[in-house]
């Protein structure tokens, strides 16, 4: 069966029907490049006016305008708010009332696209494997990133969160139109990784999405992540304004000027320092969501009532922090280089600015306890990675899981740890799962490109797709069309249950209280330390003044991860697509 032309609020669209075998039978309808909104520079998105005739939705549209990896040029375009749909079809009748999974990509709120990295037309975020294996509809889309998506003056003149509003427009479009493609508009799951995972979290917290989202999955990121909210957007807006020659004293005049500035100039006015700086790299990412009093009306920690009826899966990779550790402490990955106590202390103090000297010392002490018994370089390097993983991913995710569970009415809560080791040959032998390593398995790459993977990789991918799509169907990762290797029990506040995802998932993979000692340290010991104000404004700009100076944080909550690798059109597959 195949859909043919589908009528949407914008008009008719026609995709392509791809047979899954030469013998006919099952197939997938694929629609690429359906417009879901339009947007002017630094303005909220608006409904697309539509078209006449039948739109041929057969090619991915360009990504939203963003800097290239070298940060000396741009690619993509401003006209970028398009979405893509994969609809699995059986032999006879066209599908109807299927669960819908809407993907939000990561990229530090700075880069990325709905189709993901591409190698020889093999796109990372190709929804075909998830759709056909899980019998769900998959939707991916573009949203604005970087200054064009998140620049804010912190007031009504440039409220920011344009990229988040783009995401909302896509979700709302799906709600209004997906029935025509055979989807169930009352069963929408949003899922994403890193900045996409934090976006998923923010969308569930925003009052704008009331009634739109049934379930959510956050992979390595949360609204509570210290890199997910910018607390001092005006500083960064002024930095950009100065670079492009706009006035900075009056936010109204600054906003008016920025809106008529060449968008490419705005994009290139911000440069991310990727060489080691005085502070952790995540401090230097400026253009991220803000608490605007509207779309995000309050600090995310105060918005969990809004998730009371949204089922949630949240988890991290066991070495999510590795990517950032390699930038902050480059010796981590170099066998011939050593990590020193001083290196680690500098990293710790950079992440604990808000609590000053006492915070840095207490944190350093607990993380280096094992160094007395085992002062090996391997242990010290693993500590650096564990610390970055905890601060940037684990602790915010654990707090969010507890908040979700505590506020749940009908909602169910599930937690996981992805531990299937990275396949990067250049990594140390002790390496676990790096940031973004989970993506290739969720999107079924071991099946789509089997020659590049081992049977154990296919086992991981099969299990993840089964759990993810069962959850989208029923709100329970164990119940649905796909058999799973073991029962995944819900998260409880008492036991902190989580599923450890490895190549062999058994009943022993259900574990409890992940890194409990460190969670208690951050939630209790560190939390009660007095916040200091004196030495927080000492962040110095990068040496090259073409790179944007970091914002003096008013607390330690505005750090954001940084991409060391490109997710550009020609990135190798499988690629590490960060954040």
């Amino acid at each position: 069966a195949k859909l043919g032309a589908v009528y949407t609020e914008g008009g008719f669209v026609e995709g392509v029907n791809k047979k899954l075998s030469l013998l006919g039978g099952d197939s997938v309808d694929i629609f690429k490049g359906i417009p879901f909104a339009t947007a002017k520079t630094l303005e909220n998105p608006q409904r697309h006016p539509g078209w006449q005739g039948t739109l041929k939705a057969t090619n991915f549209k360009k990504r939203c305008l963003q800097a290239t990896i070298t940060q000396d040029n741009t690619y993509g375009q401003e006209d970028c708010l398009y979405l893509n749909i994969w609809v699995p079809q059986g032999r006879k009748q066209v599908s109807h009332n299927l669960p819908v999974m809407v993907w939000i990509y990561g990229g530090a709120f700075l880069m990325g696209s709905g189709q993901g990295a591409n190698f020889l037309k093999n796109y990372l975020y190709d929804g075909e494997e998830i759709a056909t294996r899980g019998n769900v509809i998959v939707v991916t889309f573009n949203y604005r990133v970087g200054p064009l998506g998140f620049l804010s003056t912190g007031d009504a003149n440039l409220p920011g969160n344009f990229g988040l509003r783009d995401q909302h427009m896509a979700i709302a479009w799906v709600k209004r139109n997906i029935a025509a493609f055979g989807g169930d508009p009352d069963n929408i799951t949003i899922f994403g990784e890193s900045a996409g995972a934090a976006s998923v979290s923010l969308q569930t917290l925003s009052p704008y999405n009331k009634g739109l989202i049934r379930r959510a999955i956050s992979q390595s990121g949360m609204a509570l992540s210290p890199w997910a909210i910018q607390k001092n957007p005006l500083f960064w807006a002024k930095t950009i304004a100065k670079k492009v020659g706009c006035p900075t004293e009056d936010t109204g005049k600054m906003a008016a000027c920025l809106k008529i500035t060449d968008p490419r100039a705005l994009t290139l006015a911000y440069k991310l320092p990727v060489k080691k700086q005085e502070y952790p790299v995540v401090h230097y990412l400026a253009f991220i969501p803000v608490i605007d009093g509207d779309f995000i009306p309050d600090d995310p920690i105060n918005l969990y009532n809004n998730t009371a009826d949204i089922d949630y899966i949240a988890g991290i990779n066991n070495m999510d922090g590795h990517l950032f550790a390699t930038i902050d402490v480059p010796a981590v990955d170099k066998t011939k280089q050593t990590v020193t106590e001083e290196d680690f202390y500098r990293l710790v103090s950079g992440h604990t600015v808000a609590k000053g000297l006492k915070g840095a010392q207490a944190t350093f002490d607990i993380y280096t306890e094992s160094w007395a018994q085992d002062p090996s370089q391997e242990n010290m390097k693993k500590t650096v990675v564990a610390f970055e993983t905890d601060v940037l991913f684990l602790i915010p995710t654990e707090i969010a899981l507890a908040q979700h569970k505590a506020h749940a009415k009908s909602a169910k809560t599930y937690s996981y740890l992805f531990s299937h080791p990275s396949r990067m040959p250049i990594y140390p032998k002790w390496m676990g799962a790096d940031h973004a390593d989970d993506l290739q398995y969720v999107f079924g790459k071991p099946f789509a490109t089997p020659l590049g993977y081992r049977p154990q990789d296919r086992a991981v991918s099969k299990a993840m797709i089964a759990y993810w799509t069962n959850f989208a169907r029923s709100g329970d990762p164990n119940m649905g069309n796909s058999p799973v290797p073991t029962h995944w029990y819900p998260y409880t506040l008492e036991n902190g249950n989580y599923l450890d995802i490895t190549k062999t998932i058994t009943s022993a993979s259900m574990k409890e209280h992940l890194r409990e000692k460190f969670l208690k340290f951050w939630a209790v010991t560190f939390e009660v330390l007095p916040t200091v104000t004196g030495d927080q404004d000492t962040l110095t700009p990068p040496e090259d003044d073409s790179e944007v100076a970091p914002d003096p944080p008013s607390d330690d909550s505005q750090v954001v991860p940084v991409p060391p690798t490109d997710d550009s059109v020609e990135a190798q597959m499988p690629a590490t697509i960060g954040f």
Epitope: V6, E9, G11, R47, W51, G53, R176, N177
Partner: antibody, heavy 119, light 105 residues
């Protein structure tokens, strides 16, 4: 100017079919979608479906799926709506209506065709 | 399907009055359209995209709203304005409100 002229009133028996025509003029026929909307006596408006006269693509609301067929004849700039297995509750005025612009509201309407279903 | 709730279902007013008709959508929608229909006639487009007036529609008609709540306002009723008014949302399956009959008081 845009004009949509519909065929005349029809009286049908239950179980029969009816085919209503809508002839368009004053614009490029294949450039705008044509919708069909019906209104039962003393009732509100009900959208039935839409046809793209350019390629003949159609979409029908769930309620009429399997009973309604919309076609077009580009040589005469006419669209047709056929409703089968008529029942008494199908008694209504049937309107064709053209998009105003883009995917927009229904900006131009035919005069309506009364279809009466009675035994 | 998107549900449309129009209120009031009927309304009595006098020439010169200011009249407001509301339409609530569930879930939220992007844009709302409004139509006027007189007895025995086809509907006529009055407001599109929540607040835009097609050419030929008098400026006493205005529309506002976003998300779930939309309003049609007639600033000063004229004799020819007594009719039935319908709101309509545009999704993959467009739906109309049940109508508001505006009568002379």
């Amino acid at each position: 100017q845009v004009q949509l002229v519909q065929s005349g009133a029809e009286v049908k028996k239950p179980g029969a079919s009816v085919k209503v025509s809508c002839k368009a003029s004053g614009y490029t026929f294949t450039s705008y979608n044509m919708h069909w909307v019906r209104q039962a006596p003393g009732q509100g408006l009900e959208w039935m479906g839409v046809i793209n006269p350019g390629d003949g693509a159609t979409s029908y609301t769930q309620k009429f799926q399997g009973r309604v067929t919309m076609t077009r004849d580009t040589s005469t700039s006419t669209v047709y709506m056929e409703l089968s297995s008529l029942r008494s509750e199908d008694t209504a005025v049937y309107y064709c209506a053209r998009d105003y612009y883009g995917s927009s509201p229904l900006g131009y309407w035919g005069q309506g065709t009364l279809v009466t279903v009675s035994s | 399907d998107i549900q449309m709730t129009q209120s009031p279902s009927s309304l009595s007013a006098s020439v010169g009055d200011r009249v407001t008709i509301t339409c609530r959508a569930s879930p939220s929608i992007s844009y709302m359209n409004w139509y006027q229909q007189k007895p025995g006639k086809a509907p006529k487009l009055l407001i599109y995209a929540a607040s835009s007036l097609p050419s030929g529609v008098p400026s006493r008609f205005s529309g506002s709203g976003s998300g779930t709540d939309f309003t049609l306002t007639i600033s000063s009723l004229q004799p020819e304005d007594f009719a039935t008014y319908y709101c309509q949302q545009r999704s993959s399956s467009p739906t109309f409100g049940q109508g508001t009959k505006l009568e002379i008081k």
